[in-house]
């Protein structure tokens, strides 16, 4: 049985998958910051984790997914103060007893060194220096991401 947070995460991801394919994103929208092949939006307001998840979805984006330590460090370098925490797209799956990204993949234990407990209603936040497990009901900021898509010239068959 899925927790309400897991269900919310799955529902939003499924609705995103059902949407029609949009043209590739060439440049980051206004207010979004480019970090390599992603556009990031750092919220200025605060929300619990599932509201943050929903907010990113309304912006046709997702909560931040971090591939590896290198991407984590580059993201943390954009955070201006040590006392700001941001939700990312990772929470504890009670059914699988593991940290799970909102895209359905599980956390590779080498990727992030999480400070705090791995338990029900725990979600992951990042600060300038660390990665924390916090209660998902905590109201903090969040980071949305959009993938930048390199445009490839389409090859048409001869007519």
């Amino acid at each position: 049985q899925k927790s309400s947070i897991e269900k919310c995460s799955v529902d939003i991801q499924q609705s995103r998958n059902k949407t029609t394919e949009r043209p590739g994103l060439l440049n980051c929208p206004i207010y979004w910051q480019q970090l390599r092949e992603k556009c990031l939006l750092f919220s200025h307001t605060v929300n619990p984790w599932n509201n943050s998840l929903a907010d990113c979805s309304t912006k046709e984006s997702s909560l931040l997914l971090i591939r590896d330590k290198d991407e984590l460090i580059h993201t943390q370098n954009l955070i201006r103060d040590k006392a700001i925490l941001f939700w990312i797209g990772l929470n504890f799956s009670l059914s699988e007893k593991n940290w799970k990204w909102i895209n359905g993949s599980f956390l590779n234990s080498n990727d992030l060194e999480i400070r705090g407990d791995a338990k029900e209603n725990s979600c992951i936040s990042i600060s300038q220096t660390s990665v924390y497990s916090e209660y998902c009901s905590t109201e903090i900021r969040w980071i949305c991401q959009k993938e930048l898509t390199p445009v490839r010239n389409k090859v048409y068959p001869d007519s």
Epitope: H44, V46, R80, D81, K82, A83, I84, L85, R115, G116, D117, S127, S130, Y132, S133, E134, Y135, S137, T138, E139, I140
Partner: antibody, heavy 119, light 107 residues
């Protein structure tokens, strides 16, 4: 109703130690960052320290760094401030307040507990 | 550290007066500014957060404005219970810092 009740203040000699407690009720304690703010007699407010909801993340003012330690016990809904190497300039009323992540405001405060450092 | 400077440090006013208190930050803090009221022997009370948002339960005669470095707290019609000390606070960066306070006294 949100309530914050501090205790543990008193008279202590310079160089001594004291532990302040703040008992919280009326809200989901573990979901909130918490702070300590102090006010020397007849002076203004000075932020001292903050701690995240889980307790994993802590922040301190330079004036107390290395001497004070903030902690919390979420099972007891209690916030602590362990103060050591106390100085005369630490004499103040110490308030616990709800909030501490940027950009939180301190929306609820305790009544304060007086710490006097004197020989 | 961000310095917060309030002016005036004290003022005398009568019931019914319009009162304004200024707060200036040493660098831009966007709208991350809060206002507190403190009465003698009591804990501070949050009045305004995020520069202009009224905290729940606070009378509408209190209002806040400003962004960047200059901010104002206005009491549209001073009431007897408003005589107190008022502090601004920035929550833009750590350490969190307060203004030195403005004492509002009875004329």
């Amino acid at each position: 109703e949100v309530q914050l009740v501090e205790s543990g203040g008193g008279l202590v000699q310079p160089g001594g130690s004291l532990r302040l407690s703040c008992a919280a009720s009326g809200f989901t304690f573990s979901s909130y960052a918490m702070s300590w703010v102090r006010q020397a007699p007849g002076k203004g407010l000075e932020w001292v320290s903050a701690i995240s909801g889980s307790g994993g993340s802590t922040y301190y003012a330079d004036s107390v760094k290395g001497r004070f330690t903030i902690s919390r016990d979420n099972s007891k809904n209690t916030l602590y401030l362990q103060m050591s190497s106390l100085r005369a300039e630490d004499t103040a009323v110490y308030y616990c307040a709800r909030g501490g992540y940027l950009p939180d405001a301190f929306d609820y405060w305790g009544q304060g507990t007086l710490v006097t450092v004197s020989s | 550290d961000i310095q917060m400077t309030q002016s005036p440090s004290s003022l005398s006013a009568s019931v019914g007066d319009r009162v304004t208190i200024s707060c200036r930050a040493s660098q831009s803090i966007s709208s991350y500014l809060n206002w507190y009221q403190q009465k003698p022997g009591k804990a501070p009370k949050l009045l305004i957060y995020a520069a202009s948002s009224l905290q729940s339960g606070v009378p509408s005669r209190f209002s806040g404005s400003g962004s960047g470095t200059d901010f104002t707290l206005t009491i549209s019609s001073l009431q007897p219970e408003d005589f107190a000390t008022y502090y601004c606070q920035q929550t833009y960066s750590t350490p969190l810092t307060f203004g030195q306070g403005t004492k509002v006294e009875i004329k």
